[in-house]
Amino acid sequence: MNGRVDYLVTEEEINLTRGPSGLGFNIVGGTDQQYVSNDSGIYVSRIKENGAAALDGRLQEGDKILSVNGQDLKNLLHQDAVDLFRNAGYAVSLRVQHRLQVQNGPIGHRGEGDPSGIPIFMVLVPVFALTMVAAWAFMRYRQQL
């Protein structure tokens, strides 16, 4: 059993400075080139080694870019989005959505908050069951008094 894969979504403002080879990443997506089904958003497909984005370190492959210099990237054709990046100037402000994959279940990665690696529901279910049994026993005992 693989467990369920969830995503932790965070947003970040990233200010990038254009380098000799541009901003140093490639994009996919757009209304005419959907990268994710039912989502015409713009995504980072590749970060170029030694480029501006790679050396900055914050942008990651798979990130969704929500805006460039405050301009929303919703409902844009792919080429229009490309042009927007190309004409964005020297210092570029990107609003970015990171999606961190979090796996729940038996083979989930052991995170800092879960040192034993036991999924939280496996702890909560027995605790809840014991509480219910105790409550039922108490109520029954009270009725006998």
Epitope: N50, L55, G57, R58, Q60
Partner: nanobody, 117 residues
């Protein structure tokens, strides 16, 4: 064990210069960056970074022409030359490194204080 040790910080008058050093040990890195944190409640921001292999550099627009990042492979050290310093450059400067070519920096130094009066 990975270690990044910064040095060279201190108090300097406006208009002056400082050279920060970051001595790296424990492994070969792909990238090394210098970050600054002007106040504890503010986040660390990259000011300059360098590719260990190619020597390609990156600067944020507000320090380009003022700061210079360089590396000495023989000494396993990365430098940040800071010129024409202003009070706005006052911050704790951190060295960070990664053995991956992209993504977040995984290793951090303890930081060195730079104060411009």
């Amino acid at each position: 064990d990975v270690q990044l040790v910064e040095s060279g910080g201190g108090l300097v008058q406006a208009g002056g210069s400082l050279r920060l050093s970051c001595a790296a040990s424990g492994r070969t890195f792909s990238r090394v960056g210098w970050f600054h944190q002007p106040a504890p409640e503010k986040r660390r921001e990259v000011v300059a970074a360098i590719s260990w292999r190619s020597g390609d550099t990156y600067y944020t627009h507000f320090v380009e022409g003022q700061f210079t990042i360089s590396r000495d492979n023989a000494k396993n050290t990365v430098y940040l030359q800071m010129n024409s310093l202003t009070p706005e450059d006052t911050a704790v400067y951190y060295c960070a490194a990664s053995d991956k070519s992209t993504g977040p920096y995984e290793y951090w130094g303890q930081g060195t204080q730079v104060t411009v009066s």
